[in-house]
Structures are given as C-alpha cells and as structure tokens.
C-alpha cells in the first residue's frame, strides 16, 4: 500500500469486569479489540470499513497495559495499510470484546460479548508524530495513540508520491522527505540519469556516460575535446576544424606529404650533382659527367666510352684504363694494325681498302656495324643519352628513350607538367604533385578543379527599388540594378526630379538635346580630323591638358576593346554634359587592365575573358563620380540603351551593359 494507519493500544481499564449490557464476566473479562477504519462520516454508521479493519488476540483480563510487540500474534501498534491517496480525514471505531473461547482467534468464537466501544472522527495529517488520546465511559477507560505514515518508497502529504532510491542505468538518486529526487554526486537531470561531465568539457564536441568523464565526438580530441583531429591521411599538417590538413611550413600537397625543401632536408643527390625541388618525387638530380642513376650514385666505368679499338678489351684501372689488343694490333687504344687486306680483317661484310701502299688498311662497314674491323654492332645507347632515368633501347639503325612517368622528349629531358593542360578552371592556381595536379581555387569557387561556383546570390535580398531588375555582378557580393525610366541611383532609389511645368521643360530638353547632338557630331568629326594629323604623343599631351574633372569621366583607351567596329562608347554623366567624352574605335579589354577592376579588384582571381562589347557582359569601370552612367551605343538595329550601376561592398562603380 501507499500508507499505513497505525494504532497503538496503551492501557485498558475495566475494574469491575462488566460488559456493556451490565452483566459481569465470569471469571473475568478476557478482552480483545476490533478496529474499524473508514472514510470520514459526521455520524458514524454501520457498514463496510472502507479504509480497513483488524482484530487483536486476547490482550488481557479486565484491566491491563498493552506492551509494544513488533511481530507475530498480538502485534502492537496495529497496522491498517491503505492503497490510496490519504484524504486527511477519517472515522475510527474501537470496540473492546470479551471472549469465552480461543485466545489467538477470538473473533471467530461464538458467545463473544461487547464490553465497550469508542468512535473517533476528525482530520489527521500524514506524519511521524503520534496523536495520543484517552476515552472514558461509566465502566471503562482506554488510552491509545495513532498516526498515519507512508509505506516504504511513498512520500508526500498524502503518500501519493512514489520514489524508490536507485543507482543504476535508469537513475542515480535518493529520495527527499517530500518524495522529490536528490541526485547522487556527479549526476543531474529530472531523473538523475545525466552524468555531470568533466569540468570544462566542450558542450558540443564532448559528452560523457559517467561523471567526470569527457568523451569526444568524432573529429575532436583531448582532455576537454577542444582540439581537432587532422585528416586521416594528413602527414605534416594541422587543423582548425576536424579532418582539415593545413600544411606546416615547407610541406605541400593534399595531405601535406610533399616536401617543398626535399633537397635541403635530405640531400639525395650524390657525387656533386645538382638537386632541384621538382619532379614527381619532389626532387630531381642533374649528374656531373661520369655519373648516372636517379641520385647520380652510379659512377660510369672508365671503359664506358669503349676507348679500345679493333676488338681490344678494356680493363678499368684506378684512375684510367688499359687496352688488351687482339693479334695484329698495337697502341694505347689498339689503333695500329699489323694486318693488310690480304689477311681479310673486315668482319660482318665490311669491305677492305688498302692504305699507305698496302702497308695498312681501312674497313668500310655496313650499316649497324662499327669498329676498325666492323666487329662491333652499333650500340647507340653507350653514351647514356636518356636523361632523368629514362631507359635507352636500340632500334636497328636508331635508338629510342623510354621515359619514366612525368618525363618526355627525345632524351626524356622534358618534365611533363600536369599543369600544362591547365586543369584548373576559373583562374585556379595549379600545383604539380606526385599524385597529379592540385588546384588552389579563387574566392567563389571550389571543387578538385575549381569547377564548382559557390553561389551567393547578391540579388536575394532584393536590393533594387522602384521595380528595377537586379543582376548578379562579377563577384558574389556585387549586384547591378537596371533602373526603369524615371529613376536613377545605385539602387534606382532616386526619382528624376522633373518640375511641374512639364511642357516647358520638355521643350527646353528637346532643344538642348538637339544642340547637344549637333555639338557631339562636331566634336566627333573634329576628333577624327585631329586623329589623322596628330601623332600619338600629341594625343597624349592633349589628354594631359584635360582638367582633372574631365579626366574623371574618361576611360583609358588601353582598357577598352570593341570588336564591333560599328559600335561606339558613350559616357553619360548625369544632366551636366559639359565634361562628357566619347570614345570610338578604341578596344575595350578587361583581361588584366589594372584600372578597370577598380581598387577592390582581384586580378588573377577571375578567369580571363575575351568577351567584348559585341556580347552582353557588364564591364566594371571605376569612377569617382557616383552618378556616372556609361552606356554602350549599339549597332544601328539596337534601339535601346541600358544604364546600369554595379554596387560592390565598398564603392560605387560604373558598368557598361549592352543589350544584344
């Protein structure tokens, strides 16, 4: 049950040994008690004992003191367990009976007689303190105590809160008097099932399954899991985030396994050869004459050059060689002969020619044979013609070099660069490594070959006002607002201020425009005439004579490329046309023009482009004047100019946009 109503009988007095009906007990009143506990009733009535009932054995005769007894028959205090939430109120009926029969189970005996009874009604809170009471009537007196306590593992005012202390997988706690959990040291959580990790253990990177532990999640290491683990294949690199491989100084490659200073660190080249930090192994040795091998470790034999002629055999000596001549020959290299054509000295079909009036001879050898007597097969590999460890192979009258991977050329003298085929897209920088090329990508691109554009749509935030169309610029953070008629500004935020007396303005504007066009035509004609006469330095001088204000709105000709000769470029500088220039027949090239990228430009970071005004590509032109508008005047069939402005994070820049 959830709780127990306990009743301690202390003393019963029935001095005259009388029953409730006035009769006396013979020889004395052998007394036992019946207890009935039920829900609170204002008037106690017969009926079931809803909270429980219990009977005692015979406890004494007439008057007696009841001793506490913890077990067996006649237990005192009496226990009335209940299995529900204690309501706080009760009704209790205690009856004293006389039995003529069995001492141990008197309630079953016939002929039992009531001595007296008491009824208690009231409220009682759960608690350890006993409430003591005494009830008298004319014949008897009963002293007793009672209380309600919760059963083991039940707590609270009404014994309704179950709490069983535990220290296992499901929790680590003891119970408070009110039934709430009190976690054992090192544990926390509603059910005390969450361990308190080692102090300082990283919240995201670490966890624990028992107190004072710090277990790292994949990719992290250390006491507090705040140190990343480099990539599995990483050799000489570290990380700032898991699985990275940021190379230490002097190391390169995907896994930082390429020694960029191999020559210095390992001195692999022997015998005075030259080492260079290149090639598939990270180094290449260039041998001095007389040495060969990958590390120039093999000394060529003194006999390697076949100095002995006429079939003489060569013997290496400490610092030179010695020729053993065949019969008929003598000299340091067996170059002198004692034979004549009569001795048929020419082998392998060689023909003999007499010399010095027949005292000596010379052999004319067929192809593939050589030597004074045509005794040697031509070996075109003796001179070790193949560089970089290439293998020489005789191929009839010629020879070929079989090159090691990474080399080419007739003599394997050329190092094949994996970067030669420009594998890196979008201006990525290529590095030759043993396992192939590795690309370092510019901002905005990623992937093995920088082929993936990292999309960041600058137009997503809707930066253009008044119904303007937004275009993404050349770099991810740039955008272009194409303004509808009647609006200007980098974001098309300013309406063109037209006064209310509209017709007058229209007329003046019309006249002004006509005059302006005439002036422009005249300027163009004049410029053309001057062009024909003025050499380059004169035009340069003329340029220098312009005011700074005028220069601001001129685009250097070197930066312009116009492949469509019918097109012209016009610079429109707001309503003030006095300082506008027009450039014609100048090429517009924005490959690597320094001024064109503007101050924030990143030359080398963008793929080169040969796009010209003939195609619809915005060109970024730096201008100090934020209101500067540059439009391309298109070929005659085009009827529309587009004035657009490109915004970068730091500055206003002019853009040329052409509609095709």
């Amino acid at each position: 049950g959830s709780g127990i109503f306990q009743l301690r009988l202390q003393e019963f007095v029935n001095q005259r040994g009388m029953l409730a009906n006035g009769q006396s007990c013979e020889p004395g009143c052998r007394t036992f008690f019946r207890i009935c506990l039920k829900h609170f009733q204002a008037t106690f009535s017969e009926g079931p004992c809803t909270f429980g009932n219990v009977s005692t054995p015979v406890l004494g005769t007439n008057s007696f003191v009841v001793r506490d007894k913890n077990s067996g028959s006649g237990r005192n205090p009496l226990q009335l367990p209940f299995n529900f939430t204690w309501p706080g109120t009760f009704s209790l009926n205690i009856q004293a009976w006389h039995t003529p029969g069995d001492d141990l189970r008197p309630e079953t005996s016939p002929g039992n007689s009531l001595i007296s009874q008491i009824i208690i009604q009231g409220s009682l809170a759960v608690g350890k303190i006993w409430r003591t009471d005494e009830q008298n009537d004319t014949l008897t007196r009963l002293s007793y105590s009672y209380r309600v306590i919760c059963s083991d593992n039940y707590y609270g005012e009404s014994c309704s809160r179950l709490c069983k202390k535990r220290d296992d997988h499901f929790g680590h706690y003891e119970c408070q008097p009110d039934g709430s959990l009190s976690c054992l040291p090192g544990w926390t959580g509603k059910y005390c099932d969450q361990p308190i990790c080692l102090s300082g253990c990283h919240e995201q990177n670490g966890y624990c399954s028992k107190p004072d532990e710090c277990i790292c999640r994949p990719g992290w290491q250390g006491r507090l899991c705040n140190e990343c683990i480099p990539h599995n294949g990483c050799r000489h690199g570290t990380c700032s985030i898991p699985w990275q491989c940021a190379c230490d100084e002097g190391w390169g490659g995907l896994f930082c396994d390429q020694d960029l200073n191999y020559c210095t660190h390992h001195s692999p080249c022997k015998n005075g050869s030259t080492c260079s930090n290149s090639g598939p192994k990270g180094y290449t040795c260039t041998c001095l004459p007389g040495y060969t091998g990958e590390h120039c470790e093999l000394g060529l034999s003194k006999c390697a050059s076949n100095p002995c002629r006429n079939g003489g055999s060569c013997k290496d000596q400490e610092n030179s060689y010695h020729c053993l001549c065949p019969p008929g020959y003598y000299g340091q290299h067996c170059e002198h002969s004692t034979l004549t054509c009569a001795d048929s000295p020419c082998f392998n079909g060689g023909s003999c020619r007499e010399r010095n009036q027949g005292s000596s001879y010379a052999c004319e050898c067929p192809p593939n044979f050589t030597g004074s007597n045509c005794e040697k097969k031509v070996d075109r590999c003796t001179s070790n013609p193949c560089a970089n460890g290439g293998q020489c192979q005789n191929r009839g009258p010629s020879r070929t070099c079989r090159c090691r991977p990474g080399f080419t050329g007739t003599h394997c003298e050329l190092h094949i660069s994996d970067c030669a085929r420009s594998p890196c897209a979008h201006g990525g920088t290529c590095h030759d490594l043993e396992n192939g090329p590795v690309c370092t990508c510019p901002a905005g691109f990623s992937g093995r070959r920088c082929e993936v554009r990292i999309t960041h749509d600058a137009c997503a935030s809707g930066p253009c006002f008044n119904g303007a169309t937004c275009y993404t610029g050349l770099s991810p953070n740039n955008f272009v607002c194409n303004c509808p008629y009647g609006f200007v500004g980098s974001r098309c935020e300013f309406p063109v201020g037209l006064p209310p007396s509209f017709p007058w303005v229209a007329v003046s504007l019309g006249v002004g425009l006509v005059v302006l066009l005439v002036l422009l035509v005249m300027v163009v004609v004049a410029v053309r005439q001057l062009r024909l006469r003025r050499p380059d330095d004169e035009s340069r001088e003329a340029m220098n004579n312009l005011s700074d204000f005028q220069k601001d709105n001129l685009i250097p000709a070197a930066q312009l490329k116009n492949t469509n000769q019918k097109k012209e470029l016009e610079v429109d500088c707001g309503l003030d046309k006095s300082n506008c220039g027009k450039l014609q027949n100048h090429t517009l090239d924005y490959n690597l023009a320094p001024g064109l990228l503007g101050r924030g430009g990143m030359p080398g970071k963008y793929p080169h482009s040969d796009k010209s005004l003939g195609e619809k590509v915005p060109l970024r032109l730096h201008s100090e004047k934020p209101e500067c508008r540059i439009s391309a005047i298109c070929s005659p069939r085009d009827s529309m100019y587009q004035s657009v402005c490109l915004i970068s994070e730091e500055r206003n820049e002019c853009v040329i946009a052409t509609e095709v």
Partner: antibody, heavy 118, light 107 residues
C-alpha cells in the same frame, strides 16, 4: 612515408610488467592522437588505449584501467604502453596505430607479441 | 558497448568474383564506420572510413555503403591479393569496437 615501429614485447609471468614502445616517423607526431590496439592469437581486434596529441589525455578500455598506462614523448616521436599486473588474457599482438577512439586507425605498426604465461 | 556483427564469418570466392561483406551494429552508428584488411602475419590496413570514403592508395574495386546500423563492403572484382580477413569498426560510441572478422578464402 608514415612508419610506426613497435618494440618491447616478450614473455612475462602473470602479475609481471612490460613496457612497449612505438617509434613514429613520416608525420608531425605531436598533432595526432595515437592508440594501442591488440589482437589475441586467432582472435579479432580490440582497442586498448588512446592518447590525444598535444595535451596527452589518456583513455583506456575497462579491462585494463588501473593496470596499463599510455604515454607519449612528442620530442622523441615516441608512444609507450606501460603494462603492470599482467594476466593470461592480456596475451596478444599489440599494435601501435595512429588514430583516436572516435576516428579510424589510419596507420598501423607491424605489432609486437606479448605472452603472459607461467 | 556497441556490438558489431559481421556476416559471413568466412567466405570462399574466385578471382574476378564480386564479393559483399556486411556489418551490423547493435545501435545506430550514423556513418562512423571503417573497414580494415588484414593478411596473415601482417598488421591491419585501413581500406574505407566514414562508411564509403576510400583511404589513400586503396584500389577503386573496393567500395563501402550503408546507413543506420547496416554497412557493406563490396569488392567488385576479386584479385589474388584480396584474399585476407576483413574487419569493420565503429567509432561513434565509446569505446570503439570491431567486428569479429570475415575470412575471405580462395575457392
């Protein structure tokens, strides 16, 4: 080339001690966590202990806790396993490996045999 | 501890065969699973990590797949040098645990 070379194995009586060493080369040792993994004769692989790179924090499997101590000397590019109170069930080939308890073991040494027998 | 169960325990196959070995974890291990190859008298060699990423220098005939609790190692065309014992290992939970191994033999 990454190389891990173990040494120090041998025959020892139950209750005895042994110290294993592992010499590392071909990578920047101090950045990488290291581990000992063992394999009893004819049996599978069993993780024994790990130690982190720079702060040298150790972790052990329950059955060796209090008996084994993993340590490292980053200046000497060396990893160690001090084994005390050895039992028959500790008999195995002990491998030095580069890796942590929460990552794969990317590189392994050739192993050193430890035999615990009376 | 997380239990790793490999199947089959042993397997006979011929050169050129396609072979599949599976590994089942007693709990979800996400993709933190590695495969190792071990030849008799040699140390294990990492083949695959993060369930499907090929380790450096491992031939492309080896591949890995899986999710949740089940993972698979596949050898698309067996070569003579592939006959060995293969182990899986999880590294999501502490301590790391290995499978009991699958011995791949020549038929």
């Amino acid at each position: 080339e990454v190389q891990l070379v173990e040494s120090g194995g041998g025959l020892v009586q139950p209750g005895g001690s042994l110290r294993l060493s592992c010499a590392a080369s071909g990578f920047t040792f101090r950045y990488f966590p290291m581990a000992w993994v063992r394999q009893a004769p004819g049996k599978g692989l069993e993780w024994v202990a790990t130690i982190s790179g720079s702060d040298e924090w150790p972790n052990y499997r329950d059955s060796v806790k209090g008996r084994f101590t993993i340590s490292r000397d980053n200046a000497k590019n060396s990893l160690y396993l001090q084994m005390n109170s050895l039992r028959a069930e500790d008999t195995a080939v002990y491998y030095c490996a580069r890796g942590y308890y929460n990552s794969p073991f990317a590189f392994w040494g050739q192993g050193t045999l430890v035999t615990v027998s009376s | 501890d997380i239990q790793m169960t490999q199947s089959p325990s042993s397997l006979s196959a011929s050169v050129g065969d396609r072979v599949t070995i599976t590994c089942r974890a007693s709990q979800e291990i996400y993709r933190n699973l590695a495969w190792y190859q071990q030849k008799p008298g040699k140390s294990p060699k990492l083949l695959i990590f993060d369930t499907s990423v090929l380790a450096d220098g491992v031939p492309s005939r080896f591949s890995g797949s899986g999710s949740g609790t089940d993972s698979t190692l596949t050898i698309s065309s067996l070569q003579p040098e592939d006959f060995a014992t293969y182990y899986c290992q999880q590294y999501t939970y502490y301590p790391p645990t290995f499978g009991q191994g699958t011995k791949l033999e020549i038929k």
